[in-house]
């Protein structure tokens, strides 16, 4: 008579994460009688998966009828699998006794789970940063099996190779992680620029899962300012214009000085977006000339975006005024100027 | 516990078709086999075959071509029918019900509780 | 096919063991099950699978199975323990019964 056999037909078996598993096993013979068990791991260690002699196993069902008296299929189907199922699963015979004593083990079959990464999470820098710094992003994406992915950055659809990525652990897993940095140098055009993470895997078909930021929430572009006088009205008063110009963020703060006491805080909201993403902005400030018996020095201050102020001065000379002013003056686009209007 | 309750035919001629009926009492229909067993006046038992309740059987190969065991779930029944009898068929007929519940494996089960035999006499 | 083998009769003195025996081929590597069937009555499972007693079977009734024999003791036999025992396997789906031993209690 020959020796029995306990048959596992596949050496691995690969599953994605939700569905149901399936592990074949038969045996040769129903002699000697004894029960089968389903382990997974080998030695002293290994996990009971399945007894049909007794135990409580909600997800395992066996594939053909157990109580056939002919049974000679022991296969299972293990239900709604995860990651942590991954492993390997022996189909064991048993010889009848009290207690019953392991007779024979199939060869095994690995459980592999297929489980999908988690939409990949981009975050970027915790401050804002100027055109030509270099800003970092990083993208998280968890929980997916095998450890094989790829992950690729790009910037506005052109791939950037600043990268540094890690999937953890580096040893064998249930489920794995991936964490990756792109270093980003950032321009004044960037505000309407777009990083993103894209993560590819055997689980997704070939439709790479993407997580995307923002560059406007890592940029800040710094104002320029332009102060200009307009013509002298006949009422004595001079018209002088700050012209703020490609910022960004919109949060700022536009304050006015005569004689270095504040005359008018205006704060920008609503304002118009210029094609770059940036915004502009005017204020004016009406100087009446005849109520100062001293040259008046203007100062245009502005604070964007929590930075430091930045100011253009200038003097309107009160002793010689033309009653009709030629063509607008303009202060120098430095940090601080002072510029007599005459 | 189950109780097993048996009838039929007690006398029929050569060729006909015996016909036997067991009513189940009790326990759960879904979790036994249900065995027919004769034995001949002086000898000993001799198994016919089993169904359970889906209606799997198995037959006693010596048997097997005469031989047509049916389950009916509704009434908690099961019945044997044997073809072109002859006297050899002669013997009393049991019905016993083999209980393998959810912790059983094959081969793990016998005939715990039988009906009371009918007696089934094959004479021209 | 399968067969198990039994010898026919077997006496013993009242408050003795009695043995009865069942042979096949490698029958340790089945399940045995034996029955006690008194005249005119049906039979009644005292043991099965191999050493296990039904509820309200005396103790002295008890089994065991090894290599090519299954044996049925009865310890401290009593004269209402006389009747025909059967020893029953399995083979193939098929439940197979040995001829039977007649217990006869002197």
């Known amino acids: 008579e020959e020796e029995l056999q306990v048959i596992q037909p596949e050496k691995s078996v690969s599953v994605a994460a939700g569905d149901s598993a399936t592990l074949n096993c038969t045996v040769s013979s129903l002699i000697p009688v004894g029960p089968i068990q389903w382990f997974r791991g080998a030695g002293p260690g290994r996990e009971l998966i399945y007894n049909l002699k007794e135990g409580h196993f909600p997800r395992v069902t066996p594939v053909s009828d157990p109580t056939k008296r002919n049974n000679m299929d022991f296969s299972i189907r293990i239900s709604n699998i995860t990651p942590a199922d991954a492993g390997t699963y022996y189909c064991v015979k048993f010889r009848k006794g009290s207690p019953d004593v392991e007779l024979k083990s199939g060869a095994g079959t690995e459980l592999s789970v297929r489980a999908k990464p988690s939409a990949p999470v981009v975050s970027g820098p915790a401050v804002r940063a100027t055109a030509e710094h270099t800003v970092s992003f990083t993208c998280e994406s968890h929980g997916f099996s095998p450890r094989d992915i790829t992950l690729k950055w790009f910037k506005n659809g052109n791939e950037l190779s600043d990268v540094q990525t890690n999937v953890d652990p580096a040893g064998k897993s249930v489920s794995y992680s991936i964490r990756s940095t792109a270093r980003v140098v950032l321009t004044r055009r960037d505000v309407h620029s777009q990083v993103i993470c894209e993560v590819a895997h055997v689980t997704l078909q070939g439709d790479p899962l993407r997580g995307t930021a923002n560059l406007s929430e890592a940029i800040r572009v710094p104002p320029f300012l332009e102060v200009t006088q307009q013509s002298m009205r006949a009422d004595n008063q001079v018209n002088v214009t700050c012209q703020v110009t490609k910022f960004y963020p919109q949060r700022l703060q536009l304050t006015w000085l005569e004689n270095g006491n504040v005359s008018r805080t205006e704060m920008a909201s609503a304002l118009p977006e210029n094609k770059d993403g940036t915004y502009n902005w005017t204020s004016w400030l009406l100087v009446n000339v005849s109520a100062h018996r001293d040259d008046v020095k203007l100062t245009c201050q502005v604070e964007h975006d929590g930075q430091p102020a930045v100011n253009k001065s200038f003097s309107v000379k009160v002793s010689a005024h033309p009653k009709e002013q030629g063509s607008n003056t303009a202060a120098e686009n430095t940090g601080t100027n002072e510029r007599n209007i005459y | 516990q189950v109780q097993l309750q048996q009838w039929g035919a007690g006398l029929l001629k050569p060729s006909e078709t015996l016909s036997l009926t067991c009513a189940v009492y009790g326990g759960s229909f879904s979790t036994y086999y249900w065995n027919w067993i004769r034995q001949p006046p002086g000898k000993g038992l001799e198994w016919i075959g089993e169904i359970n309740h889906s209606g799997s059987t198995n037959y006693n190969p010596s048997l097997k071509s005469r031989v047509i065991i049916s389950v009916d779930t509704s009434k908690n029944q099961f019945s044997l029918k044997l073809s072109s009898v002859t006297a050899a068929d002669t013997a009393v007929y049991y019905c016993?019900?083999?209980?393998?519940?959810?912790?059983?494996?094959?081969?793990?089960?016998?005939?715990?509780?039988w009906g009371q035999g009918t007696t089934v006499t094959v004479s021209a | 096919s399968y067969e198990l083998t039994q010898s026919p009769s077997v006496s013993v003195s009242p408050g003795q063991t009695a043995s009865i025996t069942c042979s096949g081929d490698?029958?340790?590597?089945?399940y045995a099950w034996w029955y006690q069937q008194k005249p005119g009555q049906s039979p009644v499972l005292v043991i099965?699978?191999?050493?296990k007693r039904p509820s309200g079977i005396p103790e002295r009734f008890s089994g065991s199975n090894s290599g090519n024999t299954a044996t049925l003791t009865i310890s401290g036999t009593q004269a209402m323990d006389e009747a025909d025992y059967y020893c029953q396997a399995w083979d193939s789906s098929t439940a197979v019964f040995g001829g039977g031993t007649k217990l006869t209690v002197l």
């Open positions: 099965y699978q191999d050493d």
């Open positions: 016993a019900s083999s209980h393998y519940g959810s912790g059983s494996f094959p081969d793990s089960y016998g005939m715990d509780v």
């Open positions: 490698k029958l340790g590597d089945r």
